[in-house]
Interface confidence: medium
């Protein structure tokens, strides 16, 4: 069904629809505030073709602007560097008529000793090195610059840094003799704000810093530097928030513990406790205040640095999510769930929910995946019927309206949106998981049996038979 | 909902040491710190100090050298232990939690009087 | 240390009045990033702990009613009652919570009702 899409690649879109911009006055760049979408809620569809056709129209006054491309620009304070000593950079597209600023930041695990970064530069060297990286990106998602794909932010000055420092954005030590790799994500990251200012930046009225998985868990550790950063240096009145995404994890106690032998196998409490001595990893200021030395790693983890933050900051994490499955020694190789394990999974969707019964702005969709802003179809999920842009648009307003962070939400326009049901994929807008060996789709319904529910079980609470609920979860209901 | 209930000993000998504990429910210490605060009769309110869930104190520079917190996590306990109390540290002593957030004083036991004479 | 200082010391009015009393900081409370002003105001009654009655400046905590309003930025800040009753007899603190240790508290303002 529509409401569970497959993520498709970006290539397989239409042609974008043009971008349209309001000529600022006397040169002075003019806010682009975002698409309110509450009086059309209920017919979207309509609203965006007459978006799509009001762009068509004033094609001829932005032809200049069709271009969809990040281009790359190579840090020009060389001492910055990706792991292998190699350049850090950005992908940059401007916006001049907006005042809104994303920086978004790559995500892509980690390596913590000598051993396993040597494994990553001879398999993942992108991760590591600029030397590769192409001259341009195309902005996908929350990166997108159709009004289409990315309702939210559709406007605003795009940023894509890319991960090469495998620190998960907290290291500061460069590359030496005694040093075969730099880490330097959190230097990146100070590095690209202070280029950025020079580029624009410095007019900004709102920085968003968003990031996915490792990029995610950067938000976490690195959002209230950047915004103080920014105070240093001279721009107070920037508003620095963050959007971490897919990066909000659990020390929790694996399925099955293994030794710290690789990146996948090992606890992430280890593998994070010997990466930090590695990278000479930095953690937030007031979080470290919190824990005993040696204990800083416990700053990795979304539930206990967030209630330290000072930045305002929107949680967005699959309450199953993939990533968080293998660091626990989960692998779903295709065979049938056996109930222990069954159990384990359903129990980690209600931990981590429980993480969040505190975070006041977040969307955690009980969908068994990773990732999700830069998905070019990150607009489909639902939680409680509101999609993550409009989730993020009413976080916006809710931040615009009263700088106060009241506890009570705009109405009509909720912002803390977390799924209740306590299975993977019982919501029906979740994407469309595979087989992981034949490739082929599964509907809901199969999943769930593959994944050794009863439907009895399943169906009871629900006040149904279990031949309705295969009946609706089969229309993807 | 949220509790914490501070228990001390009464009256205190002037040069000797003043131990409260303060017993919480409801909540993890594993998940919230803990701050003390102090009331001398008629007066205003004076922050003591803090444990964080992850077990760091921070305490108030004029009286660090005296005070000490610490906590037993599994009994749900927190432990404030004051040395060569003086007739001025006679208080009401108060412990507090804060929101998720940051450091405002949500909750709050009902206070334990300790008369120094 | 961020030193706190309350104004007046206390006032007495009627049941019915308007009371605004007076909170100033040493140091601006203003966090630029998000905005947010970290002074908070309680209310303690006699023979009573403490009470959250305003966070953030201007936040009424759940169940304050909306007589008590909290307003400033930077440096100055007020709690104002609108509307004065008997049970709203007790001394009002304000607290820093921008910086620490230590977080520090004002001398207080003693509310008494004529």
């Known amino acids: 069904s529509e409401g569970r899409k497959t993520w498709r690649r970006r290539g397989q879109q239409p042609p974008p629809p043009p971008r349209t911009e309001a000529a600022p006055a006397a040169g002075q760049p003019v806010e682009s505030f975002p698409l309110d979408f509450t009086a059309v809620e209920g017919n979207m569809d309509s609203f965006m073709a007459q978006v799509k056709s009001l762009a068509q129209s004033l094609y001829p006054c932005s032809a200049q602007q069709l271009n969809e491309d990040l281009r790359l620009h190579l840090l020009l304070n060389t001492s910055v560097t990706c792991n292998d000593g190699s350049p850090a950079g950005y992908y940059l597209k401007e916006s001049r008529g907006s005042r809104r600023w994303l920086l978004f930041l790559e995500g892509g695990w980690y390596c913590f000793n000598r051993e396993n970064c040597d494994s990553r530069y001879d398999t993942m060297r992108r991760l590591m090195s600029s030397r590769d990286w192409p001259r341009t990106r195309t902005g996908t998602g929350i990166l997108s610059s159709q009004p289409e794909e990315n309702p939210y932010w559709w406007n605003a000055n795009m940023v894509f840094i890319p991960y090469c420092s495998s620190d998960v954005w907290s290291g500061a030590s460069s590359k030496s003799e005694k040093n075969e790799y730099a880490f330097m994500g959190a230097l990146i990251i100070q590095e690209v704000v202070r280029e950025l200012l020079g580029r624009g930046l410095s007019g900004a009225k709102v920085l968003l810093l968003a990031g996915s998985s490792a990029g995610g868990t950067g938000v976490l550790l690195n959002v209230d530097r950047v915004a103080e950063q920014l105070e240093k240096l001279g721009y107070p009145a920037i508003q620095v928030r963050g959007l971490a995404d897919s990066g909000w994890f659990l020390d929790n106690k694996q399925y099955r513990h293994t030794d710290c032998v690789d990146t996948i196998t090992c606890a992430p409490t280890e593998a994070i406790r010997r990466g930090i001595r590695y990278w000479n990893g930095v953690v937030p200021e007031r979080c470290r205040r919190q824990f005993q030395e040696g204990e800083e790693w416990n700053c990795f983890f979304g539930y206990k640095v967030y209630p330290t933050l000072r930045c305002p900051v929107f949680v967005v994490q699959w309450l199953f999510d993939e990533a968080q499955l293998t660091v626990d020694n989960v692998h779903l190789t295709g065979q049938p769930v056996q109930e222990g394990l069954r159990l384990y999974i359903q129990n980690l969707g209600r931990e981590l929910r429980h993480t969040l019964k505190d975070v006041p702005a977040s969307f955690a969709p009980a969908c068994l995946s990773h990732e999700i802003i830069i998905r070019s179809h990150w607009t489909d999920v639902q939680v409680k019927g509101t999609s993550l842009p409009r989730a993020l648009h009413c976080w916006d307003r809710s931040l615009h309206d009263s700088h106060k962070a009241s506890k009570t939400p705009l109405k009509g326009c909720p912002v803390h949106l977390v799924d209740s049901c306590p299975w993977p994929h019982c919501n029906p807008s979740c994407p469309t998981v595979r087989d992981q060996f034949t490739g082929q789709e599964m509907n809901v319904a199969q999943f769930l049996m593959h994944m050794g529910f009863d439907m009895q079980t399943v169906a009871q609470p629900q006040g149904l038979e279990p031949s309705e609920l295969l009946g609706m979860l089969s229309n993807g209901s | 909902q949220v509790q914490l209930k501070e228990s001390g000993p009464g009256l205190v000998a002037p040069s000797q040491s003043l131990s409260i504990t303060c017993t919480v429910s409801?909540?993890?210490?594993?998940?919230?710190?803990v701050q003390w605060v102090r009331q001398p009769p008629g007066k205003g309110l004076e922050w003591l100090g803090v444990?964080?869930?992850?077990?760091?104190?921070n305490y108030n520079s004029a009286l660090m050298f005296r005070l000490s917190i610490s906590k037993d996590n599994s009994k749900s306990q927190v432990f404030l232990k004051m040395n060569s109390l003086q007739t001025d540290d006679t208080a009401m002593y108060y412990c507090?939690?804060?929101?998720?957030?940051?450091?405002?004083?949500?909750?709050w036991g009902q206070g334990t009087l300790a008369p120094v004479s | 240390d961020i030193v706190m200082s309350q104004s007046p010391s206390s006032l007495a009015v009627s049941v019915g009045e308007k009371v605004t009393m007076s909170c100033k900081s040493s140091?601006?409370?203003?966090?630029?990033?998000?905005?947010?002003?970290?002074l908070a105001w309680y209310q303690q009654k006699p023979g009573q702990s403490p009470k959250l009655l305003i966070y953030?400046?201007?936040t009424r905590e759940s169940g304050v009613p909306d007589r008590f309003t909290g307003s400033g930025s930077g440096t100055d800040f007020t709690l104002t009652i609108s509307s004065v009753k008997a049970e709203d007899l007790a001394v009002y603190y304000c607290?820093?919570?921008?910086?620490?240790?230590?977080?520090?508290f004002g001398g207080g303002t003693k509310l008494e009702i004529k």
């Open positions: 507090a939690r804060s929101y998720n957030y940051d450091v405002v004083f949500a909750y």
């Open positions: 409801e909540f993890s210490l594993n998940s919230y710190g």
């Open positions: 444990i964080w869930a992850g077990g760091i104190t």
């Open positions: 140091q601006s409370l203003l966090y630029s990033s998000n905005q947010k002003n970290y």
């Open positions: 953030w400046a201007s």
């Open positions: 607290q820093q919570y921008y910086s620490y240790p230590p977080y520090t």
